[in-house]
């Protein structure tokens, strides 16, 4: 016997105090798949939170963050404080890196500087606490009659916080 | 009868975290939302968040969302909470309380008997 | 979010004699669902969507009311009916509460 309720498409629900008709969501409230028994309650995107996409009968409100915080988490489940580059966000708020570590991002945290010596180069600029270090050519490769120079390494890319 | 049997009463320290479980009977587990409610000493009821069994779907108040965790086991019928980084004000009654989405009104039915938790150090 | 204010807080009353216990919304709702709460005890279903008395609720309770103002009435109030009574909406994320209107009978 096929359940009456799987006729119910996205956007309705099916009323089990109705004799299982299918009843269109209620206001604030919406269902994605069809044969639901229950619409569910619109994410409402509020404080530091913003509408990214409004909350339609068939899919739920999208939220991203308002300026100065970015989203972490599945689905933006949470906003986050921007820092600038060059700090790292603690409990006690933007701190700036400490001497050896840099952000070149407005999240995350500070990141050790590349040790240039243990891939037997040399450091071509210094490091700060926005930048990494760039290291240069391994100092044999500076000796006289050295055919060419080794390019520079990439700079590290800093992880990011989880999405 | 329609039933929802809540997990004994827990005590833990400051920072810590607890899980308790309300078991439901007597109904189609899936057929219906189950939400959870803070009762703390003289304060008002405040609502915690919602589970949608059939499909996991949660939807929390904004002042719980960092710290609560809603789940729900189909094949026990059972759906659990879960509340980190524990402080005082958390110390309260909670409620698991069955909601039948379909009237569309989210009222409140049937009520689990509360657990009590203490959080003192 | 919206604030559920109870009126009064606490109301004393003798048998027999007319209750009115007052809800308001701080913006407008669709309808209020009451519950009532003895010591001791998890809250129960009394009223929803405004006027449906919940089962097993004596016909002696009444519920009305619109926009931001409702009420829960009890006609000739009895014994047994000694306890707090709950305001609850969900017209806006999240459900709210009020806080409470405790009846005591004489």
């Known amino acids: 016997l096929q359940d009456p309720c799987s006729n119910c498409p996205a956007g309705t629900f099916c009323d089990n105090n109705r004799n299982q008709i299918c009843s269109p969501c209620p206001p604030n409230s919406f269902s994605s798949a069809g044969g639901q028994r229950t619409c569910d309650i619109c994410r409402q995107c509020k404080g530091v939170f913003r509408t990214r996409k409004e909350c339609s009968s068939t899919s739920n409100a999208e939220c991203d963050c308002t300026p100065g915080f970015h989203c972490l988490g599945a689905g933006c489940s949470m906003c986050e404080q921007d820092c600038k580059q060059g700090q790292e966000l603690t409990k006690k708020g933007c701190k700036d890196c400490c001497f050896g570590t840099f952000n070149d991002q407005k999240r995350g945290i500070c990141r050790p500087w590349t040790n240039c010596s243990l891939d037997g180069k040399s450091v071509l600029v210094n490091g700060t606490k926005e930048r990494d270090v760039v290291c240069g050519p391994s100092p044999a490769d500076l000796s006289p009659g050295a055919s060419s120079v080794t390019p520079p390494a990439p700079a590290r890319e800093p992880g990011h916080s989880p999405q | 009868q329609v039933q929802l049997v809540q997990s004994g009463a827990e005590v833990k320290k400051p920072g810590a975290s607890v899980k308790m479980s309300c078991k439901a009977s007597g109904y189609t587990f899936t057929f219906y939302t189950m939400h959870w409610l803070k009762q703390a000493p003289g304060q008002c009821l405040e609502w915690i968040g919602y589970i949608n069994p059939s499909s996991g779907y949660t939807n929390y108040n904004q002042k719980f969302t960092d710290r609560a965790t809603l789940t729900a086991d189909k094949s026990t019928s059972t759906a659990y909470m879960e509340l980190s980084s524990l402080r005082s004000e958390d110390t309260a009654v909670y409620y698991c309380a069955r909601s039948d989405g379909s009237s569309s009104k989210w009222y409140f039915d049937v009520w689990g008997q509360g657990t009590t938790v203490t959080v003192s150090s | 979010e919206i604030v559920l204010t109870q009126s009064p807080d606490f109301q004393s009353a003798t048998p027999k004699e007319k209750v009115t216990i007052t809800c308001r919304a701080s913006?407008?709702?669709?309808?209020i669902h009451w519950y009532q709460q003895k010591p001791g005890s998890s809250p129960k279903a009394w009223i929803s969507a405004t006027s449906n008395l919940a089962s097993g609720v004596p016909s002696r309770f009444s519920g009305s009311g619109s926009g931001t103002s409702y009420t829960l009435t009890i006609n000739r109030v009895e014994a047994e009916d000694a306890a707090t009574y709950y305001c609850?909406?969900?017209?806006?994320?999240?459900?709210?509460f009020g806080c409470g209107t405790k009846l005591e009978i004489k």
């Open positions: 609850q909406q969900w017209s806006s994320n999240p459900f709210t």
């Open positions: 913006s407008s709702v669709s309808y």
